[in-house]
């Protein structure tokens, strides 16, 4: 259970500066790039490069922009409506199921195998057996990969190992 998630609260932020743009909420919600004021009367714009919101919302604060880690490159900066996009540096990759860090790509395939896929920021090199052509990732699947129901095939009821 404890491995599921640890969710941090938003960083403490100052109240909106007077120069920030304000508009009125629509049906109690503010548009992307804004958050709602505490009294619910105003939509206050997020601060470019500091925080953002991507959808209509009733958030009291915009969300903090992600800072790319060392070992990552910034593909696109944080705007008021979109978080920073970070990508692993060349020669490293991040799998969808283990997003915490970039891992080094393997330099070659095991004996008896040939490389059919290059190292990309989101995948290791891909190797197949010379004879059979079956794929080999070179790694034992992580527990989560084996138990997480894919969006297309939810269990009924969903029962998964944490």
């Amino acid at each position: 259970e404890s491995a599921l998630i640890t969710q941090q609260d938003l960083a403490p932020q100052q109240r909106a500066a007077p120069q920030q743009k304000r508009s009125s909420p629509s049906e109690g919600l503010c548009p992307p790039g804004h958050h709602i004021s505490e009294d619910g009367r105003d939509c206050i714009s997020c601060k470019y490069g500091q925080d953002y919101s991507t959808h209509w919302n009733d958030l009291l604060f915009c969300l903090r922009c992600t800072r790319c880690d060392s070992g990552e490159v910034e593909l696109s900066p944080c705007t008021t409506t979109r978080n920073t996009v970070c990508q692993c540096e060349e020669g490293t990759f991040r799998e969808e199921d283990s997003p915490e860090m970039c891992r080094k790509c393997r330099t070659g395939c095991p004996r008896g195998m040939v490389k059919v896929g290059d190292c990309t920021p989101w995948s290791d090199i891909e190797c197949v057996h010379k004879e059979s052509g079956t794929k080999h990732s070179g790694e034992v699947p992580a527990v989560e990969e084996t138990v997480t129901s894919s969006p297309g095939t939810p269990a009924s009821p969903c029962s998964l190992s944490g």
Epitope: L4, L63, E96, D97
Partner: nanobody, 126 residues
């Protein structure tokens, strides 16, 4: 084990209301955002709403804004999606979900979620 058990779907006339529930077995529910998605026949699963871990503030898809309300009771380990002024185009299977990890404060894409409810059918007749 992480279990998300959904209830509250059904058949409703256009303009009507329904409330979906999502009960979680996991103690970390109280520190996790909760997302709601829906999938209509022949279409991809789409984002509906996501609520902050503390229940204070949520995201809503443009198509449901002003009509749907996401809420969360951490003491009961249950999330709710209140759906008002329903339209025929809201007809879909609705899923609640917990993120696979805490690297996003308010995830809004399918790939950021790893734990899914069983889904509940919502049918809106005209």
């Amino acid at each position: 084990q992480v279990q998300l058990v959904q209830s509250g779907g059904g058949l409703v006339q256009a303009g009507g209301s329904l409330t979906l529930s999502c009960a979680a077995s996991v103690s970390t529910f109280g520190t996790s955002p909760v997302g709601w998605f829906r999938q209509a026949p022949g279409k991809e699963r789409e984002f509906v709403s996501a609520i902050r871990w503390d229940g204070v503030g949520a995201y809503y898809a443009d198509s449901v804004r002003g009509r749907f309300k996401n809420s969360k009771d951490n003491a009961k380990r249950t999330a709710y999606l209140q759906m008002n002024r329903l339209k025929p185009e809201d007809t879909a299977v609705y899923y609640c979900a917990l993120p696979r990890r805490g690297d996003s404060e308010l995830p809004s894409t399918v790939k950021e979620y790893g734990y899914w409810g069983q889904g509940t059918q919502v049918t809106v007749s005209s």
